[in-house]
C-alpha cells in the first residue's frame, strides 16, 4: 500500500486513508486521512472502501465520526449519537 | 456482458409486503452499489435508496424509512427491495439499478427491466 | 429536498435540428467545483439509460451528438443534431444531497 503520496484507488493507501482528490491539482488524486473530529466532510462522500475514482477532496469520517449538517450548507465531522 | 434481472410482476393488497429481486451479473459484484429507483404509471423517476453490495450499508430516501428495506446475497450476486405496509400510491415499475463508480456523481449505468408491483383490494 | 424542475415539458424538433432541454435546481448542485447532475433519456417501454454524469461527461457508448452543460443551479441538455432514435423522455438528476431528486421529464418528439 502507498502510505502517502499519488494513488488512483482506496487500495492504494494504507488504514485510516482514502484516495482522494488533491485539493491543489484536480487531475491527481492522493492518499489523504480520513475526516477527523471537527473536519469538514460532505456526507455522499464514498465509504471506504470505494473501488471507483473519487471526486471529493475530502475523505469520509473516521469509524465513530458521522458527517452532520452544522448550517446550511456546512457539513463537520462529528460523534456518532 | 453486464446484466440485472429482476424478478416477475406482483399484485399486492394494501397493508401487504412485497419483495423484488435483482440478480446481477457479469461483473464483479461487491464493487458496486446498487440503488432502487421506481416510477409510477405514466410518471417520472423517484430514488428509493441504495446499498453497499460490499458492507451492505444502506442509505433510504427518507420518505420511505421505516417501510423500505434494501438488502443483498453476496453469495447470489442479488440484491433485494422489500416495500412494507402496501397503498395504492406504491402501484408502480420497480427498477434496480448499478451505480457506475463514477466517484461521488451516484450515476446509474446498468438498469434492471423492472417489476410492476400492482397495489389493490 | 432539492427541487428539479425541467422545461419545456415537451419539444418537437426537426430531424437534424437541435434539441435544448433545461434544467433548474432549487439550490446549488455544486460541490468543491463539480456540478452533481446527470441526465438519463427513457424511451417507451424501457429502463432509463444514462447519457451525461457530473453535468459534462459522456458515458461510454452514447453518440457525440448529445452533451451536457451548466453549473450551480441551472442545466443543460443539448442534442446537436436530433435522430429519429432519439424520441424519448430525458430526466435530470441531482445527487449532491440526499435524497436524489429526478426532473419530471421533457419528452423529445419530430416535428
Known amino acids: 500500500a502507498v502510505i502517502t503520496g499519488a494513488c488512483d484507488k482506496d487500495s492504494q493507501c494504507g488504514g485510516g486513508m482514502c484516495c482522494a482528490v488533491s485539493i491543489w491539482v484536480k487531475s491527481i488524486r492522493i492518499c489523504t486521512p480520513m475526516g477527523k473530529l471537527g473536519d469538514s466532510c460532505h456526507p455522499l462522500t464514498r465509504k471506504v472502501p470505494f473501488f471507483g475514482r473519487r471526486m471529493h477532496h475530502t475523505c469520509p469520517c473516521l469509524p465513530g465520526l458521522a458527517c452532520l449538517r452544522t448550517s446550511f450548507n456546512r457539513f463537520i465531522c462529528l460523534a456518532q449519537k | 456482458e453486464v446484466q440485472l434481472v429482476q424478478s416477475g410482476a406482483e399484485v399486492k393488497k394494501p397493508g401487504a409486503s412485497v419483495k423484488v429481486s435483482c440478480k446481477a451479473s457479469g461483473y464483479s459484484f461487491t464493487d458496486y452499489d446498487m440503488h432502487w429507483v421506481r416510477q409510477a404509471p405514466g410518471q417520472g423517476l423517484e430514488w428509493i435508496g441504495y446499498i453497499s453490495c460490499y458492507s451492505g450499508a444502506t442509505t433510504y430516501n427518507q420518505k420511505f424509512k421505516g417501510r423500505v428495506t434494501i438488502t443483498v446475497d453476496k453469495s447470489t450476486s442479488t440484491a433485494y427491495l422489500e416495500l412494507s405496509s402496501l397503498r395504492s400510491e406504491d402501484t408502480a415499475v420497480y427498477y434496480c439499478?448499478?451505480?457506475?463508480?463514477?466517484?461521488?456523481?451516484?450515476?446509474?449505468?446498468?438498469w434492471g427491466q423492472g417489476t410492476l408491483v400492482t397495489v389493490s383490494s | 429536498d432539492i427541487v428539479m424542475t425541467q422545461s419545456p415539458d415537451s419539444l418537437a424538433v426537426s430531424l437534424g435540428e437541435r434539441a435544448t432541454i433545461n434544467c433548474k435546481a432549487s439550490q446549488s448542485v455544486d460541490y468543491d467545483g463539480d456540478s452533481y447532475m446527470n441526465w438519463y433519456q427513457q424511451k417507451p417501454g424501457q429502463p432509463p439509460k444514462l447519457l451525461i454524469y457530473a453535468a459534462s461527461n459522456l458515458e461510454s457508448g452514447v453518440p457525440d451528438r448529445f452533451s451536457g452543460s451548466g453549473s450551480g443551479t441551472d442545466f443543460t441538455l443539448t442534442i446537436s443534431s436530433l435522430q429519429a432514435e432519439d424520441v424519448a423522455v430525458y430526466y435530470c438528476q441531482q445527487i449532491n444531497e440526499d435524497p436524489f431528486t429526478f426532473g419530471q421529464g421533457t419528452k423529445v418528439e419530430i416535428k
Open positions: 439499478a448499478r451505480d457506475g463508480n463514477y466517484g461521488e456523481a451516484y450515476a446509474m449505468d446498468y
